[in-house]
Every structure is written in structure tokens, then in C-alpha cells.
Interface confidence: low
């Protein structure tokens, strides 16, 4: 018989229904059955412990005392439910130089103070903006690109017409306010949009108005990265500006996150009929 | 240049409260960062006791928590330190210092320190 | 609290030597470690930070390494003004710890 329920591990939980649990009380659910917020299952004679976390997509990363990253603490605490051991939440942000990042899967607010979660100024980025955690300010940043959406003309609540549910959504995100889809098709007096740069754009929510401008001036002062940053940017371009501490990422295509790590699963598509949206 | 100096009485009766404060220039308290106070022992041990971060919030060590606060006068741009029911075992040369930036706790900017005697 | 202990306590070199200063950290702190430079009378200064870059302004010949829970500080061609203390710091968890102190003196 297995001593613990970690001996019967698969992919997407525990089953150990191979074994008699008449024999071994093991396999009843009861509040030990599960650690690290499994959820226990019992179907028939299978009991199975299931990690099937509802994370939210908010990008808040932390690094993990296994040294990884992960897109949130939520994440972090999936993964050690699937793992079936601890993991602590040892800083903000990515690990600097971590294995690879938990799926998505993110500081220690450690042994001082557990009832006080740190405030933090990124709570006012909106709109699918991410935090860069490392600004001396707040500065969010919107990672969002539009250039593999196909051509599909929307009108927007903002009165102007887009190519795509993307650049709606990049909108939103670079003007810090809500946008929505008002109507399939290009709105009736025409006005369309003009679209950003390939890279994620880097403004002060209380700048938006300024965004264009503080992103060109930002882009003439980038610099390539020191050679201690190899890997800082997993799938991108690692860029340094003077007039930022740490160096910024310009994620490929179909990539997001601080450090590029994450898989743009973000993009909208518009489903026929009521307006409504899917996110794939 | 950011500069941090630290001020206040370097004699201190026991079981009296500690009080002293860190004027910053060259950067706004408010701006960024987390400002901490540190301490080191006459045997050179250096211990952390505390941050005010740049919106306010704190974090204590455990073991002072009970004794400690750190609070901050934005419209002076500094930040002080008051730690209550002192012992000799507080004798130490005091530092305040800045946080290197956000997630990354290592510490660029120290003031030159005071030296708090606490005897009766 | 996550404990730091720092090896050797103190140690004799010449101009131009290597030097190499190791910190053990009591449980994984990652790459949460930074280290400081402290003359006599004078507030500890930033050398490293996230175990391995050199802060703004740091000669070359200071380089740290390491993950986990092992770290060291080289210094790879020791110059008149290292002579002082050299203390590791952890900021893995709260509180955030520093080792004991390595005094580097004058052979």
C-alpha cells in the first residue's frame, strides 16, 4: 500500500484507485486527505485530490522558494498543491534568474507580519495593464500585441472604429479607461484609430494623455542590456533605458509578462451574434 | 545626490523611548523605494529593524514589533524612528537607509549613522 | 529568521591578492543576497545585489555568485581601500538578516 497519496501521483492530481481503501483508510476525504489545498474526490472507489485552483490572470509575480516564478500567489499555490510540497513566496517579481516560470503558475511577507499583505500602487493598473514592479513610480505597462489579430472592424463605446477586438483592448489598456465593443463593423462616421509600435508601452496611468510622447522619448534612450541579463528576457528583447533602474522586456509575439515568460492567451476574439467576448 | 542623515539624542535612559529621525534630499520619501533603519552592535552585528515604504505601509523585524515604530513627515521629506522600553542592550550605532527599488531589499543609500548610548 | 553565516570571520592578505568571502544562508534564499563594503567609522556601502550584479559605480574587480543557499564575494585583485568589513545581507523573507562580518586586514 502507498503510505501517502503523493505515492499515487498523476499529471492532474492523485488516483489511487488501484488500491483497496477498505484495507487502508487512507483513501477516505477527510480534512488531512489533501494538504496544500487539494480537493478531495471520491468517485466510487477512487479518491483523487484535485489542484484545480480558479486563479485569476492578474500579473503580480512572485518568486517561489523553489526558485521559480510564477504570474501570482495563486499560481504559486497551485503548484505546490500539485507538487504536494511547500512553496513559499520568497520576493516580489519574477525570480532573477529562475528555471523557467510555474505556467503562469509568482514577497515573502515571511515571518514579520502575515496579517499586513504589503499595499501596493500597482492596485491602479487597469484595463490589462501589468505593474513594473521595479519603477520608482507607478508605471503600468501595456504588453499587448495586436499584430497577429485578424481584420475585423469593430466600433468602440469610445465612437471610433478599430481593426480588431485587440486593439480595443490595447486601447483600454493604454488610456487606463473602459472600452467596449458597441457594434460589429466600422462605426458610422468613420473614425478609425491609429495603432501603436510593436512594443509594449510604458506610461504613467496619471500621463495617458502624454503616452505617445513618453513612449517615443523613452525608445531613443534604450540601450542594449548588460551582459549579466542574459536570460532576463525569455521571449524577447532585453532593453535598457537611462532613465529606468531595471532593464525592460520587448516580449515576441504571442509573449507577455515582465520578462516575456508568460503566453499571450489574452487575445480577444469576437463570438457572432450578441456582442459578447471569449477569451481564448 | 540622494543624501540620508540621521538626528537625535545619542544618550538614552533605560526603559525611556528612543526617537530619532532621518532627513532625506534628493529624492521624495514619497516617490519610491522603502527606507529602512538598521542597527550595529558594538561587536559590529548588523541588525534590520524596519521599513516605511513609499506609500506609507510598514514592515517591522519581529523581534522589535512590540517596541517599534517607524512613521514619516512627508511635508519634511523624513522619516523617524521610536523605540520604546530601552535597555542597554540598545546601545548601538544607528543607520538609516534606502531600499534599492521594489522586490530588491538591498539597501544604496545609508546615512553615516549615530551612536545611541542608553545608560542611566 | 533565516541565519547567515559568513566564513572566515576575518582574514590577512596583500595588494593584488584574491579574495574570496563565502555566506551560508540557513534555507533557500534564492538569489536575495546582497553585500556591503564597511570602513572604519564609516556606514556600510552596496556592493552586490541579487547575489551577482555589481551596484552603480562598483569596480570590477568585485564579483558575487551563487543561488540557493551558498554565496561568495570575490575580490579578484584586492586594492589598499578593501581593507575593512564585508557583511552579507539576506532579503529573502522578513526580517532580512546579515551575516557576522568578515574583517579583511593587512598581512
Known amino acids: 500500500f502507498p503510505t501517502s497519496l503523493s505515492d499515487c501521483q498523476t499529471p492532474t492530481g492523485w488516483n489511487c484507485s488501484g488500491y483497496d481503501d477498505r484495507e487502508n483508510d487512507l483513501f477516505l476525504c477527510d480534512t488531512n486527505t489533501c494538504k496544500f489545498d487539494g480537493e478531495c474526490l471520491r468517485i466510487g472507489d477512487t479518491v483523487t485530490c484535485v489542484c484545480q485552483f480558479k486563479c485569476n490572470n492578474d500579473y503580480v509575480p512572485v518568486c517561489g522558494s523553489n526558485g521559480e516564478s510564477y504570474q501570482n500567489e495563486c499560481y504559486l499555490r497551485q503548484a505546490a498543491c500539485k507538487q504536494q510540497s511547500e512553496i513559499l513566496v520568497v520576493s516580489e517579481g519574477s525570480c532573477a534568474t529562475d528555471a523557467g516560470s510555474g505556467s503562469g503558475d509568482g514577497v515573502h511577507e515571511g515571518s514579520g507580519e502575515t496579517s499586513q499583505k504589503e499595499t501596493s500602487t500597482c492596485d491602479i493598473c487597469q484595463f490589462g495593464a501589468e505593474c513594473d514592479e521595479d519603477a520608482e513610480d507607478v508605471w503600468c505597462v501595456c504588453n499587448i500585441d495586436c499584430s497577429q489579430t485578424n481584420f475585423n472592424p469593430l466600433c468602440a463605446s469610445d465612437g471610433k472604429s478599430y481593426d480588431n477586438a485587440c486593439q480595443i483592448k490595447e486601447a483600454s489598456c493604454q488610456k487606463q479607461e473602459k472600452i467596449e465593443v458597441m457594434s460589429l463593423g466600422r462605426c458610422q462616421d468613420n473614425t478609425t484609430t491609429t495603432t501603436k509600435s510593436e512594443d509594449g508601452h510604458y506610461a504613467r496611468t496619471d500621463y495617458a494623455e502624454n503616452a505617445n510622447k513618453l513612449e517615443e522619448s523613452a525608445r531613443e534612450h534604450h540601450i542594449p542590456c548588460p551582459e549579466h541579463y542574459n536570460g532576463f528576457c525569455m521571449h524577447g528583447k532585453c532593453e535598457h533605458s537611462i532613465n529606468m533602474q531595471e532593464p525592460s522586456c520587448r516580449c515576441d509575439a504571442g509573449y507577455t509578462g515582465q520578462h516575456c515568460e508568460k503566453k499571450d492567451y489574452s487575445v480577444l476574439y469576437v463570438v457572432p451574434g450578441p456582442v459578447r467576448f471569449q477569451y481564448v | 545626490d540622494v543624501q540620508l542623515q540621521e538626528s537625535g539624542p545619542g544618550l538614552v535612559k533605560p526603559s525611556e523611548t528612543l526617537s530619532l529621525t532621518c532627513a532625506v534630499s534628493?529624492?521624495?520619501?514619497?516617490?519610491?523605494?522603502?527606507w529602512s533603519w538598521i542597527r550595529q552592535f558594538p561587536g559590529k552585528k548588523l541588525e534590520w529593524m524596519g521599513f516605511?515604504?513609499?506609500?506609507?505601509?510598514?514592515k517591522y523585524n519581529p523581534s522589535l514589533k512590540n517596541r517599534i515604530t517607524i512613521s514619516r513627515d512627508t511635508s519634511k521629506n523624513q522619516f523617524s524612528l521610536k523605540l520604546s522600553s530601552v535597555t542597554a542592550a540598545d546601545t548601538a550605532t544607528y543607520y538609516c537607509?534606502?531600499?534599492?527599488?521594489?522586490?530588491?531589499?538591498?539597501?544604496?543609500?545609508w546615512g553615516q549613522g549615530t551612536l545611541v548610548t542608553v545608560s542611566s | 529568521d533565516i541565519q547567515m553565516t559568513q566564513s572566515p570571520s576575518s582574514l590577512s592578505a596583500s595588494v593584488g591578492d584574491r579574495v574570496t568571502i563565502t555566506c551560508k544562508a540557513s534555507?533557500?534564499?534564492?538569489?536575495?543576497v546582497a553585500w556591503y563594503r564597511q570602513k572604519p567609522g564609516k556606514s556600510p556601502k552596496l556592493l552586490i545585489y541579487s547575489a551577482s550584479n555589481r551596484h552603480t559605480g562598483v569596480p570590477s574587480r568585485f564579483s558575487g555568485s551563487g543561488s540557493g543557499t551558498d554565496f561568495t564575494l570575490t575580490i579578484s585583485s584586492l586594492q589598499p581601500e578593501d581593507f575593512a568589513d564585508y557583511f552579507c545581507?539576506?532579503?529573502?523573507?522578513?526580517?532580512?538578516?546579515f551575516g557576522g562580518g568578515t574583517k579583511v586586514e593587512i598581512k
Open positions: 545581507q539576506q532579503y529573502s523573507s522578513y526580517p532580512f538578516t
Open positions: 534628493g529624492y521624495s520619501i514619497t516617490s519610491g523605494y522603502y
Open positions: 516605511i515604504s513609499y506609500d506609507g505601509s510598514n
Open positions: 537607509a534606502r531600499g534599492l527599488r521594489r522586490g530588491d531589499y538591498s539597501m544604496d543609500y
Open positions: 534555507q533557500n534564499v534564492v538569489t536575495a
